[in-house]
Amino acid sequence: MMTGTIETTGNISAKKGGSVILQCHLSSTMAQVTQVNWEQHDHSLLAIRNAELGWHIYPAFKDRVAPGPGLGLTLQSLTMNDTGEYFCTYHTYPDGTYRGRIFLEVLESSVAEHSARFQIP
């Protein structure tokens, strides 16, 4: 039975050219996290964090994606095209798969701020 919940940074905004942290947190379960996958809105994989093999950033994103903090992901040099949904998929044993959603809006305005509050989607 899956008892856990994924908390995410929810809807966030950030400045064009800046950076943003995408964070998910799995709670209320003792399941072992074997792998976390980070996907973009078009379902392309940005990064994998395997519990045994470590981090793998996909080649197309190597220049703009940094692992961490923790199981999160840092997107750098943001462009307007980065606006959209991001998904964290937690593969766990024995529970199975948990999935969280974050919506990132990249703003031209210099007043854009990265909101770091956690929300349950």
Epitope: L53, Y58, H91
Partner: antibody, heavy 122, light 107 residues
Framework: QVQLVQSGAEVKKPGASVKVSCKAS????????MGWVRQAPGQGLEWMGI????????SYARKFQGRVTMTRDTSTSTVYMELSSLRSEDTAVYYC???????????????WGQGTTVTVSS | DIQMTQSPSSLSASVGDRVTITCRAS??????LNWYQQKPGKAPKLLIY???SLQSGVPSRFSGSGSGTDFTLTISSLQPEDFATYYC?????????FGGGTKVEIK
Amino acid sequence: QVQLVQSGAEVKKPGASVKVSCKASGYTFGSYYMGWVRQAPGQGLEWMGIIDPSGGRTSYARKFQGRVTMTRDTSTSTVYMELSSLRSEDTAVYYCARARTPSSWPYGMDVWGQGTTVTVSS
Amino acid sequence: DIQMTQSPSSLSASVGDRVTITCRASQSINSYLNWYQQKPGKAPKLLIYAASSLQSGVPSRFSGSGSGTDFTLTISSLQPEDFATYYCQQSLLTPFTFGGGTKVEIK
């Protein structure tokens, strides 16, 4: 050319251990993950685990955890797979296989060793 | 672990036939699906990676398609050397599990 050469056939008694080697040549050894796959007689392919030759990190299939150890020797460009507490069901051909892309997630194994037959019999 | 289910487990076909083999994953694996060919007594050979990319040196009569959970390997015109066993494998999540195989035999 890129090549993986495995050690010769082994016959072992139940409860014993076996260590199979896989020597790589023709490419930068540390840049490609190396996986191990086995095939019992008349059966399909079974993924056992994988090792990152540069750092030595490993990931094993849950079925083999506690019984399998994968190591590497960068000085000889060789990876090893040791399986302990052997039983008759471990009788199989054991293959090493190289990941298709360097310094990346190991999707697809493009170069395979010739296979090592391990027979477990009392 | 992700379960990979292949169908059919065996099929009989003639030279020149179009052959289709399917592979289903127990959960979405995006496009992280590989196809291998294995002949008796030989090591497997990578045919297709990332669901639809043809491995270097593999004839163009082999093609792959699909994403998510459902995938297909197609041989457009079966040749004598294509009689073998074919395996799918997911490479999204460790352990990188294989399907049970599909044996392509001569009719």
